[in-house]
Structure formats: structure tokens, C-alpha cells
């Protein structure tokens, strides 16, 4: 599974969208986790509503918000007030029982706000938008291929 690289400005919001086959993952909750080390476990940050039919409602844990459009097959994670410590490798997951299926791997990079830099020059930052979609440096060519379904008993 390829890794999608997303860049966001410190202090702003970064929105991550993970797409999936809506029918294949019907009835499954989604989660956003942070991978601890390259081969380490993925530590849950936030997951969608416990009742799947209410997955469209936003669930928050600290500065991270998740919501799932189960019909469109898109789970959206928003990292608010991005900080340098938020940089790292994350996963969008589909949950069923004990199984956590990786939908997408995302490498979050945090850029320093150029306005804080005296040498920023004439770089223009939109005033109205505090949300940053993220510069997709590398697209995943297999974002719907799962490689880590299930940890078997």
C-alpha cells in the first residue's frame, strides 16, 4: 500500500480524505491512527460514531475530528491547529470486530508558517481560509487495496 504525503501549515487545519468501497465496508466503523515507528503498532487517535448509522456525525478527540460519508465511501479527518508534533505516519482504517483494515497510509508533514519567517518575501497566503487541503506530493495508486486486514487470533 503506497503512502500519500500531505503537507499542512502550522497553526492551520489539514483535511485528509480516505476513499473506500462503500459496499465492501458496509457496516464498518472507521478510525484514524498514528503509527509508532515504521513497524510499530498504530495507536488509535479517533474513530467514528459507535453506531454505524450515525457515522456522519463528527467525532472529536482533542484537535482531531473524524466523520464518515458511508454512502459516498469517504472518511474525512481534520487535524485542527496543526503543530510540528503532529507530523508523522498515520493510517485510515476500517474496523470490524478485532480486524483493522488499512484503507490508506498518510504521511503528514507540517510546514512552518512563512509569515513567521522574516525572509518569507512575497509568498501569499489566503486570509479567509484557515483550512489547508494539503499538497499531495505522492498519490497512492492503490488506495483501496488492503494489506493489513485482520490480525488473526
Amino acid at each position: 500500500l503506497n503512502t500519500t504525503v500531505l503537507q499542512g501549515m502550522a497553526g492551520q487545519s489539514l483535511r485528509v480524505s480516505c476513499t473506500y468501497d462503500a459496499l465492501k465496508h458496509w457496516g464498518r466503523r472507521k478510525a484514524w491512527c498514528r503509527q509508532l515507528g515504521e513497524e510499530g503498532p498504530c495507536q488509535r487517535v479517533v474513530s467514528t460514531h459507535g453506531v454505524w448509522l450515525l457515522a456522519f456525525l463528527k467525532k472529536r478527540n482533542g484537535s482531531t475530528v473524524i466523520a464518515d460519508d458511508t454512502l459516498a465511501g469517504t472518511v474525512t479527518i481534520t487535524l485542527k491547529n496543526l503543530q510540528a508534533g503532529d507530523a508523522g505516519l498515520y493510517q485510515c482504517q476500517s474496523l470490524r470486530g478485532r480486524e483493522a483494515e488499512v484503507l490508506q497510509k498518510v504521511l503528514v508533514e507540517v510546514l512552518e508558517d512563512p509569515l513567521d519567517d522574516q525572509d518569507a518575501g512575497d509568498l501569499w497566503v489566503p486570509e479567509e481560509s484557515s483550512s489547508f487541503e494539503g499538497a499531495q506530493v505522492e498519490h497512492s495508486t492503490s488506495r483501496n487495496q488492503e494489506t493489513s486486514f485482520p490480525p488473526t487470533s
Partner: antibody
Framework: EVQLVQSGAEVKKPGESLKISCKGS????????IGWVRQMPGKGLEWMGI????????RYSPSFQGQVTISADKSISTAYLQWSSLKASDTAMYYC?????????????????WGQGTTVTVSS | DIQMTQSPSSLSASVGDRVTITCRAS??????LNWYQQKPGKAPKLLIY???SLQSGVPSRFSGSGSGTDFTLTISSLQPEDFATYYC?????????FGGGTKVEIK
């Protein structure tokens, strides 16, 4: 009518290859997982594995991993179970079944539609 | 793998009896538990999914209960057509293992 129709009984010799089929109709074949279950003579049910025909994503029971191959051809709504080299111990009834869709707060679906079964006999 | 243990392995009962079959998982499986009925020479039939949800078309005399590791299938009033073998199955983690089965015979 939603149904799964399996291929007919097979009699084979040890070492031979075999591919049995399971054809779905009456529903969107690509949108449901299909599982395979073995039942040896006079014994209980054994879960072999599942496949999602939409993208051929497959999960195997460790007991059957490497022993059989599960595949699907979504263009003809058919799932397959195959052996490259049969053994006498593969003699059994094999069922294909559809995993139902979520309809509650827990996504335990159950296998809600079953094929009629395919008898495989392996004997020298 | 998660082991599913059914008890009893067989039982004899009469028409009209209340019959209870239990299934125990080797670890907690929440409510990811299904029950099937199989008659000789036939494919299994789904009775109960998600531990307690009655599958469409299944008579209301069948009911399921339990959560975690201990589950029960109850037939409130045994009918002639209910003499069969019953299997539980967990869907909590691959492989989705079955119990060994409980054969319900006529007394």
C-alpha cells in the same frame, strides 16, 4: 430469487487438480463477500476463507492457506475454489455461501445464502 | 484462532420441549456470533446473526442471547422440523470459526 448454484460432484485421483465453482444470481454479486466452508463426511463445518468479488480481496483460514486457492470472476458472477494437487483427505462436501450485509449496530452478518454443496471424492 | 466450544454435543428432546444450546468462545467476541441449523444432506441455514437478531423467515420460537464469551440458542417449543444439528460461528476475527455442532434428536 437470490441464489448460489455450485458445480456438480467430482471424483478425482490423488495428485490431480480441481476447480469447483459457485455462481451467484438475483443480487449484486460484486457487493457481497463469498465464503467457502468444508464439511468432511460425518463431521462439522470448517471455515476455509472468503473473497470479495468486487476486487478479489481474499482472506484464508491458516488451516487452508497454501492448500487451496479462492478466486472470483465478477464478469460471470462466479467464485471458485481450487486445488493444484488433491489428497484423499480433501474428500468432503464444499459449500459456498454469501456473507449478508450489515443491518443493525453490530456488523456480524452471518452467511445468509448457501449453495447446494459440491461433493469432492478423492480416491486412488 | 478463536475456538468455539458447543455443549452439549448431542441431546434428546420431545416435541414441545424447551431446548437450550450453549456456545463458548475462547476469548471475547462481543456480539459477533451466528447460529445455523443443518439437516442431513442439506446446506446449513442461518437462524440468528449478531448473537440475538432473528434472520428473516426464521420462526420466532428460535432466539439467541449472550455477549462476550458465552452465548445461548433457545428453541422455546421444539417442533418436528427442528430435529437437526446446530452450529455457532464467530465473526469477530478471521478465521471465522464454527463450533463443533449440537445434534438435537428425538427422545
Amino acid at each position: 430469487e437470490v441464489q448460489l448454484v455450485q458445480s456438480g460432484a467430482e471424483v478425482k485421483k490423488p495428485g490431480e487438480s480441481l476447480k469447483i465453482s459457485c455462481k451467484g444470481s438475483g443480487y449484486s454479486f460484486t457487493s457481497y463477500w463469498i465464503g467457502w466452508v468444508r464439511q468432511m463426511p460425518g463431521k462439522g463445518l470448517e471455515w476455509m476463507g472468503i473473497i470479495y468479488p468486487g476486487d478479489s480481496d481474499t482472506r484464508y483460514s491458516p488451516s487452508f492457506q497454501g492448500q487451496v486457492t479462492i478466486s472470483a470472476d465478477k464478469s460471470i458472477s462466479t467464485a471458485y475454489l481450487q486445488w493444484s494437487s488433491l489428497k484423499a483427505s480433501d474428500t468432503a462436501m464444499y459449500y459456498c455461501a454469501r456473507l449478508g450485509h450489515y443491518s443493525g449496530t453490530v456488523s456480524s452478518y452471518g452467511m445468509d445464502v448457501w449453495g447446494q454443496g459440491t461433493t469432492v471424492t478423492v480416491s486412488s | 484462532d478463536i475456538q468455539m466450544t458447543q455443549s452439549p454435543s448431542s441431546l434428546s428432546a420431545s416435541v414441545g420441549d424447551r431446548v437450550t444450546i450453549t456456545c463458548r468462545a475462547s476469548q471475547s467476541i462481543s456480539s459477533y456470533l451466528n447460529w445455523y441449523q443443518q439437516k442431513p444432506g442439506k446446506a446449513p441455514k442461518l437462524l440468528i446473526y449478531a448473537a440475538s437478531s432473528l434472520q428473516s423467515g426464521v420462526p420466532s420460537r428460535f432466539s439467541g442471547s449472550g455477549s462476550g464469551t458465552d452465548f445461548t440458542l433457545t428453541i422455546s417449543s421444539l417442533q418436528p422440523e427442528d430435529f437437526a444439528t446446530y452450529y455457532c460461528q464467530q465473526e469477530y476475527a478471521v478465521p471465522y470459526t464454527f463450533g463443533g455442532g449440537t445434534k438435537v434428536e428425538i427422545k
